[in-house]
């Protein structure tokens, strides 16, 4: 008999080159593959659980950044005057929460943000929870 | 044939508000549908594998926070003299083992210490291996 | 029915006490249950996917240390003049790539560099994508 | 190939409203910051405006901040200049410039061919 | 604001010979991201400005190997070696590494 073989974990990989004052970062999925969507600049979440969560970015400014995942909630990461993040967390993310980038900058320019090596990965932890599609 | 669906993963989120000096800090779990139990204010480990651990708070007072896992072992997490943590740490854990908090401070204070936001969570990450219950 | 089981989670700890400057670290398995093998003094990569990270050690002299998975490729991990590491990362890691270490050092001693805890552990995030063994 | 295309430019009076347009072509638009930069006769050059990539950050030059205002429509490729209580002194051609794509700082890659705005009773 | 002086202001030189513009700004240009945003230009008489140069040495894309940018911290300097009648025009630096951007006032090059 063939064992039995995992179903595809939910998890997926965007990058950002460019962040947008007071908005958030431009985020693409650079694989078809990955078993999460981007919609509307947000990672969809469609499975209960706890998700590892690991950001990365050099930025051309400082700048304060925030990632949320549910209006009137507080962040999953919370950076303030910063001009690089290289952070790892866990957080328990539900159906219905919306993965999204807030950020903002106090300087003149009048350049988007440009971002070297941003890269958000979300992973999530327990498979076998409710899912709904 | 449905396909094969994953047994629960051994997952734990626990919530602290208080800790007491040369004691260690109060956990409740605040869901009932936890896959890890909580005894005599440890985690109890059921299965042997490699967990991610994860631990947020903000204290009252700076303290020294260490988290055990077993009687004679270095501890998996040690702070000293802070007033506040948020670290990710993987460790190896087995069977029997219980995770659990030592508290130290050095202020002449008689209260307990407070804790914002304090939470420890820990995902098995290895399943499909030994579990005894 | 027998509930179905998870098949193994390939995942590795390997420990290393020494480093050779302008090469690399030894590193050893203490189990021989891992479900990754070291060969060469790398760690060899079977499945594709997202592998969980963790890097930890004290080092007898300050060294700069990079861990790599593949020629041509950036570092998993950059440390640079460091005499500790305690860092924990997220990568996407493919078959044939090998995890390995480079070490160097400026100091004009002519012994190898020792290692108080040194382990890496690798846990893959992806069970049921593409291995080949 | 890049092109910057300016017009609206023309002869209005003191006190007097202008709106100046440039269609880009040839590049990711909504990539890249836009300015207009103005030349008045026999003078040097002068940066009077910039709007970022995603319409969210505007820079003015003192002389006409409060007067000027800078928008892009980014589904049409166009960045506008819209240009009240106009002065004597506001009298150059005002050129179009994309940014060059740079880290941090700034430079201007291409230039429109420039619209002449003179502003005289 | 950055001031940027180009000298001299106006220069003639003969077919085939080298010219030299110096620009001096009035404080560093060297950014926090350790790129200094120094830019030359040549404005063609009738013509809008072309970018020559970005950062003080790189050559824009079609721009001639006539064409070098040097210098650092305050002090810059183009050099056009091997003159030819089509480089007759303005040339202006202009400094990107604080806001505003600002132009030198420009150096007219004349070939006899």
């Known amino acids: 008999q063939v064992p039995p073989q995992y179903p595809p974990i939910q998890s997926i990989r965007v990058q950002f080159t460019r962040c947008e004052n007071e908005k958030g970062c431009i985020i693409t999925s650079p694989s078809k593959d990955e078993t999460m969507k981007v919609q509307d600049n947000s990672i969809i979440i469609n499975c209960d659980g706890f998700y590892l969560i690991s950001l990365k970015g050099y930025f051309s400014e400082e700048l304060s950044l925030s990632l949320y995942y549910r209006k009137g909630r507080g962040p999953l990461f919370s950076l303030s005057k910063v001009t690089s993040v290289d952070s790892i967390g866990v957080a328990y993310l539900a159906f219905k929460d919306k993965v999204y980038f807030n950020v903002t900058t106090h300087s003149t320019s009048y350049k988007d943000i440009q971002v070297n090596g941003g890269e958000l990965i979300l992973i999530h932890q327990n498979p076998g929870g409710f899912c709904a599609y | 044939q449905v396909p094969p669906q994953y047994p629960p993963i051994q997952s734990i989120r626990v919530q602290f508000t208080r800790c007491e000096n040369e004691k260690g800090c109060i956990i409740t779990s605040p869901s009932k549908d936890e896959t890890m139990k909580v005894q005599d204010n440890s985690i109890i480990i059921n299965c042997d594998g490699f967990y991610l651990i994860s631990l947020k708070g903000y204290f009252s007072e700076e303290l020294s926070l260490s988290l055990y896992y077993r009687k004679g072992r270095g501890p998996l997490f040690s702070l000293s003299k802070v007033t506040s943590v948020d670290s990710i740490g993987v460790a190896y854990l087995a069977f029997k083992d219980k995770v659990y908090f030592n508290v130290t401070t050095h202020s002449t204070s008689y209260k307990d210490i407070q804790v914002n936001g304090g939470e420890l969570i820990l995902i098995h990450q290895n399943p499909g291996g030994f579990c005894a219950y | 029915q027998v509930p179905p089981q998870y098949p193994p989670i390939q995942s590795i700890r390997v420990q290393f006490t020494r480093c050779e400057n302008e090469k690399g670290c030894i590193i050893t398995s203490p189990s021989k249950d891992e479900t990754m093998k070291v060969q060469d003094n790398s760690i060899i990569i079977n499945c594709d996917g997202f592998y969980l990270i963790s890097l930890k050690g004290y080092f007898s002299e300050e060294l700069s240390l990079s861990l790599y998975y593949r020629k041509g490729r950036g570092p998993l991990f950059s440390l640079s003049k460091v005499t500790s590491v305690d860092s924990i990362g997220v990568a996407y890691l493919a078959f044939k790539d090998k995890v390995y270490f480079n070490v160097t050092t400026h100091s004009t001693s002519y012994k190898d560099i020792q290692v108080n805890g040194g382990e890496l552990i690798l846990i893959h995030q992806n069970p049921g994508g593409f291995c080949a063994y | 190939e890049v092109q910057l295309v300016e017009s609206g430019g023309d002869l209005v009076k003191p006190a007097g409203s202008l709106r100046l347009s440039c269609v880009a072509s040839?590049?990711?638009?909504?990539?890249?910051?836009m300015s207009w930069v103005r030349q008045a006769p026999e003078k040097g050059l002068q940066l009077v405006a910039g709007?970022?990539?995603?319409?969210?950050?505007?820079y003015y030059s003192d002389a006409v901040k409060g007067r000027f205002t800078i928008s892009r429509d980014n589904a049409k490729n166009t960045v506008y200049l819209q240009m009240n209580s106009l002065r004597a002194e506001d009298t150059a051609i005002y050129y179009c410039?994309?940014?060059?794509?740079?880290?941090?700082?700034?430079?201007?890659?291409?230039w429109g061919q420039g619209t002449l705005v003179t502003v005289s009773s | 604001d950055i001031v940027m002086t180009q000298t001299p202001p106006s220069l003639s030189v003969s077919p085939r010979e080298t010219a030299s513009i110096s620009c001096k700004a009035s404080q560093s240009l060297l950014h926090s991201d350790g790129s200094t945003y120094l830019d030359w230009y040549l404005q063609k008489p009738g013509q809008s400005p072309q970018l020559l140069i970005y950062l003080g040495s790189n050559r824009f894309t079609g721009v001639s190997d006539r064409f070098s940018g040097s210098g650092s911290g305050t002090e810059f300097t183009l050099r056009i070696s091997r003159v030819e009648a089509n480089d007759t025009g303005v040339y202006y630096c202009g400094q990107g590494t604080q806001l505003p951007y600002t132009f030198g006032q420009g150096t007219e090059l004349e070939i006899k």
């Open positions: 410039a994309k940014d060059g794509g740079s880290w941090a700082g700034y430079n201007f890659d291409y």
């Open positions: 709007i970022s990539g995603g319409g969210s950050r505007t």
């Open positions: 040839g590049f990711t638009f909504s990539s890249y910051s």
